[in-house]
Interface confidence: low
């Protein structure tokens, strides 16, 4: 299969015969890489290209979310003949090139992982010397970030008919299960869960009616650990008050 393409920037006629793998563009990435929040992860990406002895200027790029259009998280450029790819962009300073693009390796290290890093990443290389060519992985590599639960918000809010309700929001991956306990609730009450408020790792559980003063505890648990937070409800002379207390337990 032969393709002929006019490069509009250089107005060069490129003809390429697809014969052996060494003479074609391809990118090799794993389907998924898994790592824990707070740790580092390596996103492997190697490529082949048809320009056998290319040593001109090149740019290595990683983007997140969507191929071709997603925001860049890392970019570096290597001058003609140079083995050093000078970093031009590293989002929050947490992305570092591990591979050598001159050796067809764009592998990237991501430091200090957060749950927000859990998304798909796409590697891209651009040649910009005598040859003008570029290639980007279409499917990319999914970075799966795991994390023990963390309760990020617990609060008491006015409810209907002068009652009160409690809300507990936690994050974690796998998404944690939430349970309330407290006065006259017994252990592990049937809280009303409402998952995914704006982010796939967030889980919210509501306790619709707090009928007694005292300590109400929200527990979040997944396979990696559990976290607890409490809110104290007390009412006097028609007013009310609340205070909170957090406990985190991680399984290692």
């Amino acid at each position: 299969f032969v393709r002929t393409k006019i490069d509009t920037t250089e107005n060069l006629l490129n003809t390429e015969v697809h014969s052996s793998p060494a003479q074609r563009w391809s990118m090799q990435v794993p389907a998924e890489v898994s790592a824990a929040a707070g740790d580092a992860a390596v996103l492997p990406c190697t490529f082949t290209h048809p320009h056998r002895h290319y040593d001109g200027p090149l740019t290595a790029i990683w983007r997140a979310g969507e191929p071709y259009a997603g925001p860049q998280v890392f970019r570096c450029a290597a001058a003609r003949g140079s083995e050093l790819c000078q970093t031009a962009l590293s989002l929050h300073g947490r992305f570092r090139l591990l591979g050598n693009p001159r050796r067809n390796d764009l592998s990237l290290r991501v430091e200090r992982l957060a749950l927000a890093d859990d998304r798909r990443y796409f590697c891209r290389v651009e040649f910009a010397g005598d040859v003008h060519d570029r290639y980007e992985s279409r499917h990319g590599v999914r970075l799966h970030v795991t994390a023990a639960p963390r309760i990020i918000n617990i609060s008491v809010l006015p409810g209907p008919a002068h009652a009160f309700r409690a809300l507990c929001t936690a994050e974690g991956e796998p998404p944690p299960a939430l349970a309330w306990s407290g006065p006259a609730l017994g252990n592990g009450s049937a809280a009303v869960p409402s998952s995914g408020q704006g982010h796939g790792h967030l889980v919210t559980a509501e306790l619709p009616a707090l009928n007694h003063d005292g300590r109400y505890t929200c527990t979040a648990a997944n396979s990696l650990g559990r976290s607890e937070a409490s809110v104290y409800l007390f009412r006097f002379h028609g007013a009310s008050g609340a205070s909170t207390h957090h406990h985190h337990h991680h399984h290692h």
Epitope: H18, S137, R138
Partner: antibody, heavy 122, light 106 residues
Framework: QVQLQQSGAELVRPGTSVQMSCKAA????????IGWVKQRPGHGLEWVGD????????NNNEKFRGKATLTADTSSSTAYMQLRGLTSDDSAIYYC???????????????WGQGTSVTVSS | QIILSQSPALLSASPGEKVTMTCRAS?????MYWYQQKPGSSPKPWIY???NLTSGVPARFSGSGSGTSYSLTISRVEAEDAATYFC?????????FGGGSRLEIR
């Protein structure tokens, strides 16, 4: 030369399953994606999903999740698609196609099989 | 998903005439791809990355466009061009096709 040979026509009952094959020849099977496309008269072409035999990674059109399962056997350079829970809406010609790159990192289905006709009827 | 709408659904032309068919995307795409299909045959890749002809496609065919509007033009139609032409996008999943434009030669 590159060839994709698909299995023969199928006449199946509603509620049953069917598996069709797509045997690749003339290129390195593990270097390219294989895409599957559904064609019903009056409905144009519909992408079902694709599979990369080299990294055993599949991509499915959400519409066909639970309906289509894509697999590949690298030893025989054959891709398979299984359709389950068949209804009359699944009556169609199903094509496999090799997915090749172009210079911009986008893709094109450059070689197509001859198609497998599936008729769902009681 | 990105919906591709092709028009006209049916074109009728005499040999030597110029014909243009369009493909409109519901949201912007980087490139458009075109396939030709004749009755009883599989689709064939015809134009890739908006304007590039695949090997063996006659030079009377051309593709153009950007954003949400793309077109395929045949400068001088020949009898062998009678077929259905489908546009397709690889911009975002699910990859989608247009409903097709069928070209008849009078």
């Amino acid at each position: 030369q590159v060839q994709l040979q698909q299995s023969g026509a199928e006449l199946v009952r509603p509620g049953t399953s069917v598996q069709m094959s797509c045997k690749a020849a003339g290129y390195t099977f593990t270097n390219y994606w294989i895409g599957w496309v559904k064609q019903r008269p009056g409905h144009g072409l519909e992408w079902v999903g694709d599979i990369h035999p080299g990294i055993n990674y599949t991509n499915n059109n959400e519409k066909f999740r639970g309906k289509a399962t894509l697999t590949a056997d690298t030893s025989s350079s054959t891709a398979y698609m299984q359709l389950r829970g068949l209804t009359s809406d699944d009556s169609a010609i199903y094509y496999c196609a090799r997915v090749d790159y172009d210079y911009d990192g986008s893709y094109i289905m450059d070689y197509w099989g001859q198609g497998t006709s599936v008729t769902v009827s009681s | 998903q990105i919906i591709l709408s092709q028009s006209p659904a049916l074109l009728s032309a005499s040999p030597g005439e110029k014909v243009t068919m369009t493909c409109r995307a519901s949201s912007s795409v980087s490139y458009m791809y075109w396939y030709q299909q004749k009755p009883g045959s599989s689709p064939k890749p015809w134009i890739y990355a908006t304007s590039n002809l695949t090997s063996g496609v006659p030079a009377r065919f051309s593709g153009s466009g950007s954003g949400t509007s793309y077109s395929l033009t045949i400068s001088r139609v020949e009898a062998e061009d009678a077929a259905t032409y489908f546009c397709q996008q690889w911009n975002s999943k699910p990859w989608t096709f247009g409903g097709g434009s069928r070209l008849e030669i009078r």
